[in-house]
């Protein structure tokens, strides 16, 4: 059978991404500048780490953190690159429109990069749900809306609730867990006869997968800190995260052991397990007073991640049609919640503590800024999704879900690569 | 002893530049905030802009915005404040201030616990 | 978030209690209120943070309390070098806002 790409879509993809490469372009030379202001040169390399730290984690991790499908390892991948590379530009757009706007020009600085990795990551998480039934053009239309979703999300959180840089974007593992499941809910759900075999993982492109996610776990500090303003939260920010993510390694492994029969540690547990630490501390990761707490909290959110991977799957297949190896958006979704759970009980402690009172209201506005991004994740994945089923869209036959021969050149088309 | 020295104040006429600089000494100037500060005679304290200790980000009141930058240079515990296209409504005392993050019970809060004696900038034509 | 500080003057006599009042347009951590003292001619001074704990060297005669949208600086017994202007300031998201000051004036 001809694997070539569709005709309509080779029409169709090109000139989609080419015309809206061009509009940023523009949209760049039109409005944006860079910060001209003389720096310190160390703060500058030391700054630019950050970042650095977050494009590997982004690029590295998460795109080959999804390539453990038999047939569709290389799209993962190259797809997950695709997305980051657009989402940064629309990112740092969006985030200066939405805020420096009014002086007339976007300051481009590292920050507003670091900024536009992170909000790019969110599509590199929620597009889990989803990869191998989608084609590049509709995760053009994805990555537009999803951080376009982020970005507003971010700034009313920001105006209404008072909220800094680092609490605005850390409800980003909520957000992109709700919109990627909510996406896959929209999507054609049942995988037809004779595909069952492409949605199963390997072992290299399995490896490939652990290798993802242990870029994510040595730079999942980085993204916690990444914007917070002071080194001495910084500092608590990557200590807590780092014992948090280690004790959900040691749980992760233990527990998928546990939770298999014969007592064998299931790889798929394994690759999402070991963020789980990282992604439950996120919120209050500046916040834990104590070691042992980030600790505590790593081997919960261990426990619930291999509990979620052992239990979740089935019901996420039926359901949403996500595949059992994709297990990333609910992961996210309970942990997420988990991590502002932790801090909703961090600010009640720090009210009673300071004899403050108005315990009521400060959790009622936490869990407003909370139900608020589960909303707009809903509301913004849904409407993703139906546009995701237009026909303009040219979506990969369902025959053709997760299948690396549809999109990609393999000079020797051997079988079962 | 912690101290904050600004300078490079004067009378300028609208839509000009001005330059001004504070000088700290007595802290480790490269893990601290730093923040701009104005009054106008006779008037409020105005917040103007504020970078963070490593540089990397700078956030300004919607009054400037566009028209002043904020810098340090951490090699030299310099704080710089560049403003351009001054209007007669910048005429005032601009402080320079230290941002320290202290830890309450659990959050973090923060305070300008340090400020600088002010200079004044007059805008006239 | 705007703050707005009331009594805009208050005239009272040494010895006497003075209550300050700061109220925030829309709710604020109280971690991230503070108070400031303003004599003429000088830079402002710190004297409560995190909306309830003094600042280094601050008597204690002077006490902060509140949480939400309305906070309150109390001085206990008002001395001679009390009288000056009073700002509340709140930093959340930016940008960081004072109150436009409440002036304390010998009666």
């Known amino acids: 059978m001809s694997s070539k790409y569709p005709r309509s879509v080779r029409r169709c993809l090109p000139l989609w991404a080419l015309t809206l490469e061009a509009a940023l372009i523009l949209l760049f030379y039109f409005f944006t500048h860079y910060d001209a202001s003389l720096e310190d040169q160390k703060g500058l390399v030391a700054s630019y780490q950050v970042g650095q730290d977050l494009t590997v984690m982004a690029a590295i991790g998460l795109g080959f953190l999804t390539s453990s499908f038999r047939r569709h390892s290389w799209s993962s991948v190259a797809f997950n690159l695709f997305m980051l590379a657009l989402g940064v530009q629309w990112a740092i757009l969006l985030d200066g429109f939405l805020s420096q706007f009014p002086s007339g020009k976007v300051v481009i600085t590292l920050f507003s990069i670091r900024l536009a990795t992170m909000s790019a990551l969110s599509v590199l998480i929620s597009v889990d749900a989803v990869l191998g039934k989608v084609n590049l053009a509709q995760l053009v239309v994805m990555v537009l809306v999803e951080v376009t979703a982020l970005g507003n999300l971010r700034m009313v959180i920001s105006n209404i609730f008072n909220t800094d840089y680092h609490m605005n974007m850390m409800h980003i593992y909520v957000f992109a867990a709700y919109f990627g499941l909510s996406v896959a809910w929209c999507l054609p759900k049942p995988l037809p006869e004779g595909t069952e075999d492409k949605d199963q993982t390997a072992t290299i492109p399995s490896l490939s997968a652990m290798l993802g996610a242990l870029f994510l776990w040595m730079f999942w500090p980085s993204f916690n800190s990444a914007l917070l303003r002071s080194p001495i939260e910084r500092k608590n920010a990557v200590f807590n995260t780092y014992y948090a993510v280690a004790v959900s390694v040691v749980t992760a492994i233990s527990g998928s052991s546990l939770a298999h029969p014969q007592g064998k540690i299931s790889k798929t547990y394994v690759h999402s397990a070991v963020l789980a630490g990282g992604v439950a501390v996120g919120t209050s990761c500046h916040l834990i007073p104590s070691p042992w707490l980030a600790m505590v909290l790593g081997l919960v959110a261990g426990l619930i991640s291999v509990g979620g991977a052992k239990y979740l799957p089935g019901c996420c297949n039926r359901v949403l049609g996500i595949p059992h190896s994709s297990i990333m958006g609910y992961n996210f979704s309970l942990l997420g919640l988990l991590g502002e759970i932790i801090y909703i009980v961090l600010l009640v402690l720090d009210t009673v503590g300071a004899g403050n009172g108005m315990i009521g209201f400060q959790v009622l506005l936490s869990i407003g800024e909370l139900s608020l991004a589960i909303v707009i994740a809903l509301m913004s994945g849904l409407l993703t999704g139906l546009l995701l089923n237009l026909k303009i869209w040219k979506a990969p036959h369902e025959a053709k879900y997760f299948d690396d021969q549809v999109f990609w050149k393999f000079p020797h088309l051997a079988v079962g690569f | 002893e912690v101290q904050l020295l600004e300078s490079g104040g004067g009378v300028v006429q609208p839509g000009r530049s001005l330059r001004l600089s504070c000088a700290a000494s007595?802290?480790?100037?490269?893990?601290?905030?730093m923040h701009w500060v104005r009054q106008a005679p006779g008037k409020g304290l105005e917040w103007v802009a504020v970078?963070?200790?490593?540089?990397?980000?700078?956030e300004y009141a919607d009054s400037v915005k566009g028209r002043f930058t904020i810098s340090r240079d951490n090699s030299k515990n310099t704080l710089y404040l560049q403003m351009n296209s001054l209007r007669a409504e910048d005429t005032a005392v601009y402080y320079c201030?230290?941002?320290?993050?202290?830890?309450?019970?659990?959050?973090?809060?923060?305070?300008?616990?340090?400020w600088g004696q002010g200079t004044l900038v007059t805008v006239s034509s | 978030a705007e703050l707005t500080q009331s009594p805009g003057t208050l005239s009272l006599s040494p010895g006497e209690r003075a209550t300050l009042s700061c109220r925030a347009s829309?709710?604020?951590?109280?971690?991230?209120l503070a108070w400031y003292q303003q004599k003429p001619g000088q830079a402002p001074r710190l004297l409560i943070y995190?909306?309830?704990s003094r600042a280094t060297g601050i008597p204690d005669r002077f006490s902060g309390s509140g949480s939400g949208t309305d906070f309150t600086l109390t001085i206990s017994r008002l001395e001679p070098e009390d009288f000056a202007v009073y700002y509340c300031?709140?930093?959340?998201?930016?940008?960081?806002?004072f109150g436009q000051g409440t002036k304390v004036e010998i009666k």
């Open positions: 300031q709140q930093y959340g998201s930016s940008p960081w806002t």
């Open positions: 829309q709710s604020i951590s109280s971690s991230y």
């Open positions: 007595g802290f480790t100037f490269s893990t601290y905030g």
């Open positions: 970078i963070w200790f490593d540089g990397s980000n700078k």
């Open positions: 201030a230290r941002e320290e993050v202290v830890r309450g019970v659990i959050l973090w809060s923060r305070k300008f616990d340090y």
């Open positions: 995190g909306a309830s």
